[in-house]
Structures are given as structure tokens and as C-alpha cells.
């Protein structure tokens, strides 16, 4: 048994980090592999993931990590058994993906404006709370080319759009996602996405 | 039965240096941490370092540069080594393993060290 | 450095009192409750009694207990049995592998 590709980790820097790896053949990851992983500033903690499958050769394992700070970093241990395939390290701090923003609303009766506004998935108190960015995406539910992309530049979340901008009478769909510029972070997953039907009507012209 | 289980104790002069052992059974030291702890003579408990699972060792900040912590996964025991001995070192020396939540969940009987001229 | 503070530093009870050892840290433990504690009796080595400040470690009679969080912590034994004379620590664990231990607590038959 051995890995075929190295396990890679990010975390959500509040108390979650996801590893995923590829093994060199079919695996049972829950009955055959365990991840172990160990806080290096307190090592007489020592914890224990049971990996889940990712397809045949893949394995998923979600690590939990309590009060995260940025010097914080983690011994990885990978077993089958008595045997140790991979020895690693990682640092949540240096490998973010922000969770995905939440409780997307989008409001129509604001006159001729469209608001959209959501939640940051971030308690007051976290380090990320103040340093998210994000992107909303919003597509014709019919057009799939009709789609385009806002990029919501100060932290505020919220987005204020013509309804004009759209086409009139079709149902649009949005979703957002979150990234942290200074943390280097990747982007977060999308939001799940919430619907809406464009009523606005163009305002008749006089000749 | 999982048990642990020092020795290398003795007698040394100041300036000296000494290898303890811890012999475990019924644990695996490569899945687990491992704590040397020491009292002196009529005293109270002192930690002196650690090893973890991974590896990874640290050490109580007056124990940093004179001890050293190892293990040798072959033959499942852990290791201190002592050097630059002094008086104050005299005591007895314990291996622990760590358990739940940093506790020290099971100890060693402890093997003595004196350093006297 | 960080303190772990034991009181009384010894006591003198009989069988059956209750009896209750305090602990208080200099700062808040991990977590607010990586706090142990342990009975030595002479010539042997330490048994864990209590971990993650109120759990009772296996096999260890019901009547000791421990509570308390951040920097203040308890053992009580409820009933002092003749077995039970012992000397007594608590130990913390902190971040930057620093695991402290109290200067022990001593309970003497009256």
C-alpha cells in the first residue's frame, strides 16, 4: 500500500481543516488508513482522523482544530496499520479557504435596484472576520452564457445592482463566495444559490 | 499488560552524563507522547520534556541544551539522555505516556539518579 | 513563568471527612480545562486521577471529583478512606509545551 499523490490541507481557520490524498490503488480509507495529526506547540495532544472515501483511490479526512492562531502548526502522521506511509507537516495559517458565506437574500422591491445581501461566516472575534472580500455570481436560470460575475471589493456584504442591468421578465440566480486577500487565501466554496424573477419594466419612451 | 518501565539510574559525578531508559509494552511509542517527569528528594514533580508521535520533541526551558529525548521505534523504548550533570539533577526520573487532554495517564516506577563526588 | 498554586500544602483529616484540595494557575490552562490531578503515595510512582479538570480518570474510586475552569480548579475526595493518605498534584498544560505541576498537597491522618 502507498500514496500515490501527497495528502494536501486547507482549513477554514476556525476549527476546521480538510486533508485529501490519492492512494496508488482501490482503498478502503475508513477501515484501512488513519491520520494522525498533533499540535506541534502542544504534543501531548494526540489526534486521530478516520479518512473517508473520495472516489475509489481517494481519501478525505476533516481535522479538527481548535483556537487557531497564525503561528499554529501540525505534525501529519499517516498509518495503515503498523505502518507509516507519509510523515508531513502543516500550517493552517498558510492554507486558507475561507468557509462560504451564508443566508443569501436577494431583495426586489428596492425601486429600480436589485440588493443582495449575506452573512459572513465568521464570528466577530476571528481573525478572517474583518479581512473577507467576495465575488457574487449571477447567471439567466435559461442562458447559461448570460452570466456574469461582481466583485464586492470592501467588506461590506452586500451588493447593489440596476435591475436594468438584467433582462426583464427571466429568472436570475446568485451565489458568493469569500477569499482573504492578506491570509492568501483560495477562495471559498459558493453559497448555495438563491433565485429571484427580474420583473423590472423598462420605463415606456415618448416620441 | 501495557506497562513502562526505566532504568539507567546510578550514580554520577557533576559534570557527568547518564542515559535513562523506558521500556514500554502493550503501547506502540510511535503512536503516542511520552513525557520524562523528576522529583528530587522530599520535593514536588518537575517536567523535563517531551516526545511526540510524530517525532517532534521539546523541553522544560532549564532542560534545553543538557537533555535530550529520543526513541528507538525497534526496540519500543524512549530515551534521556543527561549530560553536563549537576547536584540539583539528583532525583528520580519518570517516563509517562500522555492520555486524554495532556494528562499524564500512566507512569513508569521511576529509576534513581544521584550526582554526587 | 507559569504557577501552579496547591492549598493547603498539607492537611490532617480522618476517615470519612471530606476533603478538598484547591488549585489555582497563574494563567487560564488550554482550553480553560487541561488541568490533571494526581495521588503519589511514598516510594511510588504518581496515579492520574482526575483529567481534563472534572473527568475521573478509569478505575479510580467515585469519590474523588474535581471541578473548577480557566485558573481556578478543586479536587474533593467526599469521603476520606484509610487508602486515600497520600500527597496529591495538580498539573496544567499550555500552549508552548509547558506542563506545570503544583507543589503538592500532603493529607496526614489526624
Known amino acids: 500500500m502507498k500514496v500515490l499523490q501527497e495528502p494536501t490541507c486547507v482549513s477554514d481557520y476556525i476549527s476546521l481543516s480538510t486533508c485529501e490524498w490519492k492512494m496508488g490503488g482501490p482503498t478502503n480509507c475508513s477501515a484501512e488508513l488513519r491520520l494522525v495529526y498533533q499540535l506541534v506547540f502542544l504534543i501531548s495532544e494526540t489526534n486521530m482522523c478516520v479518512p473517508e472515501n473520495n472516489g475509489a483511490a481517494g481519501c478525505v479526512c476533516h481535522l479538527f482544530m481548535e483556537d487557531m492562531v497564525g503561528a499554529d502548526n501540525y505534525t501529519l502522521d499517516l498509518w495503515a496499520g503498523q505502518q507509516l506511509l507519509w510523515k508531513g507537516s502543516f500550517k493552517p495559517s498558510e492554507h486558507v479557504k475561507p468557509k462560504a458565506p451564508e443566508n443569501l437574500t436577494v431583495y426586489t422591491n428596492v425601486s429600480e435596484t436589485l440588493l443582495l445581501t449575506w452573512s459572513n461566516p465568521y464570528p466577530p472575534d476571528n481573525y478572517l472576520y474583518e479581512k473577507l472580500t467576495y465575488a457574487v455570481n449571477i447567471w439567466n436560470e435559461n442562458d447559461p452564457t448570460d452570466s456574469r460575475i461582481y466583485d464586492v471589493t470592501y467588506q461590506e456584504p452586500t451588493l447593489r445592482i440596476a435591475a436594468s442591468t438584467l433582462k426583464s421578465g427571466v429568472s436570475y440566480r446568485a451565489r458568493v463566495r469569500a477569499w482573504a486577500q492578506s491570509y492568501n487565501s483560495t477562495w471559498s466554496e459558493w453559497s448555495p444559490s438563491t433565485k429571484w424573477y427580474n420583473a423590472y419594466k423598462e420605463p415606456f419612451e415618448k416620441h | 499488560e501495557v506497562q513502562l518501565v526505566e532504568s539507567g539510574g546510578g550514580l554520577v559525578q557533576p559534570g557527568g552524563s547518564l542515559r535513562l531508559s523506558c521500556a514500554a509494552s502493550g503501547i506502540d511509542l510511535r503512536t503516542n507522547s511520552m513525557s520524562w517527569v523528576r522529583q528530587a528528594p522530599g520535593k514536588g514533580l518537575e517536567w523535563v520534556g517531551i516526545?511526540?508521535?510524530?517525532?517532534?520533541?521539546d523541553y522544560a526551558s532549564w532542560a534545553k541544551g543538557r537533555f535530550t529525548i529520543s526513541r528507538d521505534n525497534s526496540k519500543n523504548t524512549l530515551y534521556l539522555q543527561m549530560n553536563s550533570l549537576r547536584a540539583e539533577d539528583t532525583a528520580v526520573y519518570y517516563c509517562?505516556?500522555?492520555?486524554?487532554?495532556?494528562?499524564?495517564?500512566?507512569w513508569g516506577q521511576g529509576t534513581l539518579v544521584t550526582v554526587s563526588s | 513563568d507559569i504557577q501552579m498554586t496547591q492549598s493547603p500544602s498539607s492537611l490532617s483529616a480522618s476517615v470519612g471527612d471530606r476533603v478538598t484540595i484547591t488549585c489555582r494557575a497563574s494563567?487560564?490552562?488550554?482550553?480553560?480545562?487541561?488541568l490533571s490531578w494526581y495521588q503519589q503515595k511514598p516510594g511510588k510512582a504518581p496515579k492520574l486521577l482526575i483529567y481534563?479538570?472534572?473527568k475521573v480518570a478509569s478505575g479510580v474510586p467515585s469519590r474523588f471529583s474535581g471541578s473548577g475552569s480557566g485558573t481556578d480548579f478543586t479536587l474533593t475526595i467526599s469521603s476520606l478512606q484509610p487508602e486515600d493518605f497520600a500527597t496529591y498534584y495538580c498539573a496544567g498544560a499550555y500552549r508552548g509545551n509547558i506542563y506545570p505541576f503544583g507543589q503538592g498537597t500532603k493529607v496526614e491522618i489526624k
Open positions: 509517562a505516556r500522555h492520555g486524554d487532554s495532556s494528562s499524564f495517564a500512566l
Open positions: 516526545i511526540g508521535s510524530s517525532g517532534y520533541m
Open positions: 481534563e479538570a472534572s
Open positions: 494563567e487560564s490552562v488550554y482550553k480553560n480545562n487541561r
